[in-house]
């Protein structure tokens, strides 16, 4: 049929909860292409009707929710003007009671569900949530051994659980829970994560480098909206936290009520020797109280600030 078979991706999935898989294969999907999903070599494409339990949503295949009978090989066909590529995705659905202590972990879970914390360090766990824009995700709750996590050492930040001064007792079974809303219906997403610990330095002794800011000032008019990127390079194996703080407090916590200043979602680009991370800070409206205050970007042991200042008056 003239299509290139690219690779087989294996995914282990939990029954009775939503799942989505995005058919992306750069640089193939970056141009003008059409994407069509099929199940088990069927000639009939997966439905695009959003009311269908299984349907295609742009380049995604979306299961609302996943069921036992959904196990199998799915193909996404990427057609360009002069090309055709087919990606095979092997989905295996399992029944897992995250609070069933008789089941000692799952051997073939994807790496997203196996995470490592570094003893004695400040570290984090990530709740991996891959869904199309049509899915609205609520706030994330975190559990350890089926109890909701509380305590001063734990902070929820976006999709991460920050753990300060990691101890041996922090190892074990975690879960992150979020309510997903799609077309007015609500679904629970519960991702189990097996968390192990290590004393090994996660970044081989090197420290992250903050490219920007550089402890510099920015001229900005009162009342304007401002977005500032913090750009960081770090080793691929790093476990460093990256965040914005003011007065030694996470900006999202400091401005918790007004939400006037917020931290953005972290993104990263992967290079051969390192990763380049970007996490921004957004000032919805710059106020007088913001001037002269150091807004600190932190990355592991590294930190750098920006300071807002009023533009010099123009006497022309």
């Amino acid at each position: 049929d003239g299509c290139n078979d690219i690779f087989m991706k294996n995914e282990m999935l939990s029954a009775s909860q939503p799942f989505a898989f995005n058919c992306t294969f750069p640089p193939i999907t970056s141009g003008e292409v059409s994407v069509t999903w099929y199940k088990n070599s069927s000639k009939i494409p997966v439905s695009k009707i959003i009311q269908s339990r299984i349907h295609q949503d742009e380049t995604w295949i979306l299961f609302l929710p996943m069921e036992w009978g959904d196990s199998g090989v799915y193909q996404c066909v990427i057609k360009g003007r002069d090309s055709c590529h087919r990606i095979h995705v092997n989905l295996t659905v399992f029944e897992k009671q995250w609070c069933d202590t008789s089941v000692k972990g799952l051997p073939n879970l994807s790496d997203e569900y196996k995470q490592i914390l570094h003893l004695g360090k400040d570290d984090s766990l990530t709740c991996h949530l891959h869904f199309p824009k049509s899915c609205i995700l609520g706030p994330i709750k975190w559990y350890k051994d089926c109890n909701e996590i509380t305590g001063e050492r734990f902070t929820v930040l976006e999709t991460r659980l920050l753990v300060s001064n990691v101890s041996a007792e922090d190892r074990g079974n975690y879960a992150c829970q979020v309510i997903l809303t799609h077309s007015g219906k609500q679904y629970e997403v519960l991702n189990g994560i097996t968390v192990s610990i290590t004393e090994r330095a996660g970044y081989g002794g090197s420290v992250p480098k903050i490219i920007y800011p550089k402890n510099n000032s920015i001229e900005v008019q009162l009342g304007t909206t401002l977005i500032v990127d913090c750009n960081i390079t770090d080793t691929k194996d790093n476990t460093n936290l990256r965040c914005w703080r003011v007065n030694n407090t996470l900006v999202d916590d400091y401005y918790n009520e007004s939400k006037r200043i917020r931290e953005g979602v972290e993104t990263h680009a992967s290079f051969r020797e390192y990763n380049l991370y970007t996490v921004n800070i957004t000032f919805l409206e710059v106020k007088m109280e913001d001037y002269g205050l150091p807004f600190m970007c932190h990355a592991g042991v590294s930190a750098a600030y920006i300071m807002l200042q009023l533009p010099a008056p123009d006497f022309r």
Epitope: D111, L119, I197, D237
Partner: antibody, heavy 120, light 106 residues
Framework: QVQLQESGPGLVKPSQTLSLTCTVS??????GYWNWIRNHPGKGLEYI?????????YYNPSLKSRVTISRDTSKNQFSLKLSSVTAADTAVYYC??????????????WGQGTLVTVSS | DIQMTQSPSSLSASVGDRVTITCRAS?????MYWYQQKPGKAPKLWIY???NLASGVPSRFSGSGSGTSYTLTISSLQPEDFATYYC?????????FGQGTKLEIK
């Protein structure tokens, strides 16, 4: 059950490169830490280095200039290369991994070991 | 580098004896790991995180210590305990082993 198996030549000539491969079953090398350790005859254990879940490598500084650890995720294997060998590199070489009771540093799973003799 | 010094280097003891092996680190370490090795065999994880016994390790073994001084104790030596024991630390690179303590039958 996690199993590790070392393979490679048992005899290497001085100044040449020692090459060993560890084949892993029952676990993915894209999770955890994958270690090389050696045991000199009549002497103790020496930690050589590891390759991590992300491909990051760590080498014992005493061997760093001569050692390379790499992996082939498609075959679920990781390898050790030690260049410019001398008789002092004659040892039993082990691959090992941890993760026991959620502790990555607790090396619970070991290969059976392979004796490498450096001799002309 | 953190130097790990085990004492004694070798020890002759009888079945039923209480035996203590000490591992001293040249700097503070957070946790200690102990391995048992018998001739011609791969080492076995014996004690992890200073005091936790690995699966299958008899309860006559115990581990303790903090800072720079750690011990492995056998309350009543049995014939199958005769082996070489190694301590190891991961707190500071390089991740060093002790030189080993060879436990022999008297």
């Amino acid at each position: 059950q996690v199993q590790l198996q070392e393979s490679g030549p048992g005899l290497v000539k001085p100044s040449q490169t020692l090459s060993l491969t560890c084949t892993v079953s029952g676990a993915s090398i894209t999770s955890g830490y994958w270690n090389w350790i050696r045991n000199h005859p009549g002497k103790g254990l020496e930690y050589i280095g590891y390759i991590s879940y992300s491909g990051y490598t760590y080498y014992n500084p005493s061997l760093k200039s001569r050692v390379t650890i790499s992996r082939d995720t498609s075959k679920n294997q990781f390898s050790l290369k030690l260049s410019s060998v001398t008789a002092a590199d004659t040892a039993v070489y082990y691959c090992a991994t941890g993760g026991y009771d959620y502790v990555e540093d607790a090396l619970y799973y070991w290969g059976q070991g392979t004796l490498v003799t450096v001799s002309s | 580098d953190i130097q790990m010094t085990q004492s004694p280097s070798s020890l002759s003891a009888s079945v039923g004896d209480r035996v203590t092996i000490t591992c001293r680190a040249s700097s503070n370490v957070r946790y200690m790991y102990w391995y048992q090795q018998k001739p011609g065999k791969a080492p076995k994880l014996w004690i992890y995180l200073t005091s936790n016994l690995a699966s299958g390790v008899p309860s006559r073994f115990s581990g303790s210590g903090s800072g720079t001084s750690y011990t492995l104790t056998i309350s009543s030596l049995q014939p199958e305990d005769f082996a070489t024991y190694y301590c190891q630390q991961y707190t500071t690179s390089p991740y060093t082993f002790g030189q080993g303590t060879k436990l022999e039958i008297k």
